[in-house]
């Protein structure tokens, strides 16, 4: 659900954190229409997720803690 590197919508399924290697934040006030978390998977896919949803917040927290502890 992305176009020109902007997410236009969100995935409707929960991704498991074991498949995710990182994320980037998309901000609506920086040239895109919606706020989003873009998860980067081991298979080199980019998945747009809703930053307000609980599962997304947990994964962002998990990945951020991993980076901090590196």
């Amino acid at each position: 659900a992305s176009n020109f590197d902007c997410c236009l919508g969100y995935t409707d399924r929960i991704l498991h954190p074991k498949f995710i290697v990182g994320f980037t934040r998309q901000l609506a006030n920086e040239g895109c229409d919606i706020n989003a978390i873009i998860f980067h998977t081991k298979k080199k896919l980019s998945v747009c997720a809703n930053p307000k949803q609980t599962w997304v917040k947990y994964i962002v927290r998990l990945l951020s803690k991993k980076v901090k502890n590196m």
Epitope: Q53, T54, W55, K57, Y58, V60, R61, K68
Partner: antibody, heavy 120, light 111 residues
Framework: EVQLVQSGAEVRKPASSVKVSCKTS????????FNWVRQAPGQGLEWMGS????????DYGQNFQGRLTITADESTTTAYMELSDLTPMDTAIYYC?????????????WGQGTLVTVSS | QSVLTQPPSASGTPGQRVTISCSGG????????VNWYQQVPGTAPKLLIY???QRPAGVPDRFSGSKSGTSASLAISGLQSEDEADYYC????????????FGGGTKVTVL
């Protein structure tokens, strides 16, 4: 009606441990995160930690690292909270509360609470 | 010491309007919706407001919530005796500290 039913009151000696259960009835177990919140007598609410069954992952509050273990049993749709090295300061009511994984981060349903008394 | 700051008490007479404030920071209220819980003495907390201004089914419309910047507020209009309870604000925190934070609670007394 969806409910979270917790185990009964416990009395423990200092330095021992306690395990409290939270059985969910209704709703898909893996669609939720199960959180533990405690309330000391006359005090406010304190988040302790959570378990995310679909991720098989637990997250612990800073004040409880090292002595808190939260687990879940999908077959019985039950979450557990075990707290070790108890002191009288751990005397409190312990609540479980659920959060929808696909949704915002609010506790929509709470258990009835379990009173844990730590006394010598 | 709670991450979110609430006044310890508030009061009003039946029919009055009472407002409770909840102050936080950029990593919590500033970037996440606020939830409010009501705890009647001797019972478990109950969800009162979620997503800053949404009421779950069954919550009377005399309860309303709002959020601006790093602060939120809960208003009770037409105060009733059964509203006497403790009220807690809560939200997610994007810092790497505890992800769920609460205010210290506000005891509402109906005079």
């Amino acid at each position: 009606e969806v409910q979270l039913v917790q185990s009964g009151a416990e009395v423990r000696k200092p330095a021992s441990s306690v395990k409290v259960s939270c059985k969910t009835s209704g709703g898909s177990f893996n669609d939720y995160s199960f959180n533990w919140v405690r309330q000391a007598p006359g005090q406010g609410l304190e988040w302790m930690g959570s378990i995310i069954p679909v991720f098989d992952m637990a997250d612990y509050g800073q004040n409880f690292q090292g002595r808190l273990t939260i687990t879940a049993d999908e077959s019985t749709t039950t979450a557990y909270m075990e707290l070790s090295d108890l002191t009288p300061m751990d005397t409190a009511i312990y609540y479980c509360a659920r959060v929808a994984m696909v949704g915002a981060t609010h506790f929509d349903i709470w258990g009835q609470g379990t009173l844990v008394t730590v006394s010598s | 010491q709670s991450v979110l700051t609430q006044p310890p008490s508030a009061s009003g007479t039946p029919g009055q309007r009472v407002t409770i404030s909840c102050s936080g920071g950029s990593s919590n209220i500033g970037s996440n919706p606020v939830n409010w819980y009501q705890q009647v003495p001797g019972t478990a907390p109950k969800l009162l407001i979620y997503l800053s201004d949404q009421r779950p089914a069954g919550v009377p419309d005399r309860f309303s919530g709002s959020k601006s910047g790093t602060s939120a507020s809960l208003a009770i209009s037409g105060l009733q005796s059964e509203d006497e309870a403790d009220y807690y604000c809560s939200t997610w925190d994007d810092s790497l500290n505890d992800p769920v934070v609460f205010g210290g609670g506000t005891k509402v007394t109906v005079l």
